[in-house]
């Protein structure tokens, strides 16, 4: 009889341990769900606020057709300018046409006046060819007017209504470009 009671007690204890384990698992699962829910809500909130403020360009960016432009308020060397644009999900300005060049120079005149602004153009050290940062060649009308006498790497910049060249290690403002968001009407 005592043996029977002892066996039952052991079984009960085993059951209790299993239930505690299940409860622990459930608590862990619930905590994980709550955490996921929190992330999900934050993500939804983010998406909703971006959808609510769905202008084609971010604040402080200028729109022209399919592009958004950001004119920096700080100086940096060409390579740092490029990284500053990447931080914003953009690249240094790549001028595709005379119309775009006119828009940029016109906007700069209104905003800041006659300063130097890095664009995404650099000269290959070996061949001397000018290339945009994506590897494409500029159209003939959009080549820097003067060849820099620098022994260092040479990069392109915009000043007034001209495209010029300079040592990439000099400090200038810069212009970033990204695609404008299409409004989903």
């Amino acid at each position: 009889k005592l043996l029977q009671v002892s066996t039952i007690a052991m079984q009960q204890q085993e059951k209790l341990i299993q239930q505690e384990r299940a409860l622990l698992n459930f608590t862990e699962w619930k905590r994980s769900c709550a955490l996921q829910m929190k992330y999900c809500q934050a993500f939804m909130q983010n998406s909703l606020s971006s959808a609510h403020n769905s202008s084609p360009c971010p604040n402080n960016w200028i729109q022209n057709r399919e592009s958004c432009y950001y004119v920096s308020e700080i100086w940096s060397i060409w390579h740092t300018s490029q990284e500053n644009c990447l931080k914003e999900g953009s690249t240094l300005l790549q001028i595709e046409s005379k119309e775009e060049m006119d828009f940029i120079t016109g906007s700069l005149r209104k905003i800041k006046g006659s300063y130097d602004y890095w664009v995404g153009l650099s000269q290959d050290g070996h061949s001397g060819r000018w290339l945009w940062q994506d590897g494409s060649s500029p159209s003939p009308g959009l080549l820097p007017a003067e060849r820099s006498q620098s022994a260092n790497q040479v990069c392109g910049y915009v000043k007034s209504n001209s495209l010029l060249s300079s040592n990439c290690s000099t400090w200038k403002y810069f212009i970033c470009e990204k695609y404008a968001l299409r409004s989903s009407v």
Epitope: N46, L86, K87, G89, E177, K178, Y179
Partner: nanobody, 116 residues
Framework: QVQLQESGGGLVQTGGSLRLSCAAS????????MGWYRQAPGKQRELVAA???????TYADSAKGRFTISLGNARNTVNLQMSSLKTEDTAVYYC??????????WGQGTQVTVSS
Amino acid sequence: QVQLQESGGGLVQTGGSLRLSCAASGSIFSINSMGWYRQAPGKQRELVAAITSQGRSTYADSAKGRFTISLGNARNTVNLQMSSLKTEDTAVYYCTIWARDRQQYWGQGTQVTVSS
């Protein structure tokens, strides 16, 4: 915590090709840009190529015409196809992301050795 896992490095002959891949995981919601830097022994880390979430790419002069950067289908992976490799491409290649939380995250690096 954000993790970046690089793969694809190795030893290759001059003129050969390699494809590097990098996958971002962890608590990351929004990526602004992804890219690859490299660091050769005794040199500074330099940007090789980068691509924005919109698919706009940028290359170092040394990479133009030889390397191609692309985003994976999941948009949290980035690939660097490297061809016509030269001995001067030997370096540790680091994957990086610029996230929307203003942070830049780095991978551990993968060794690329180009032998003549």
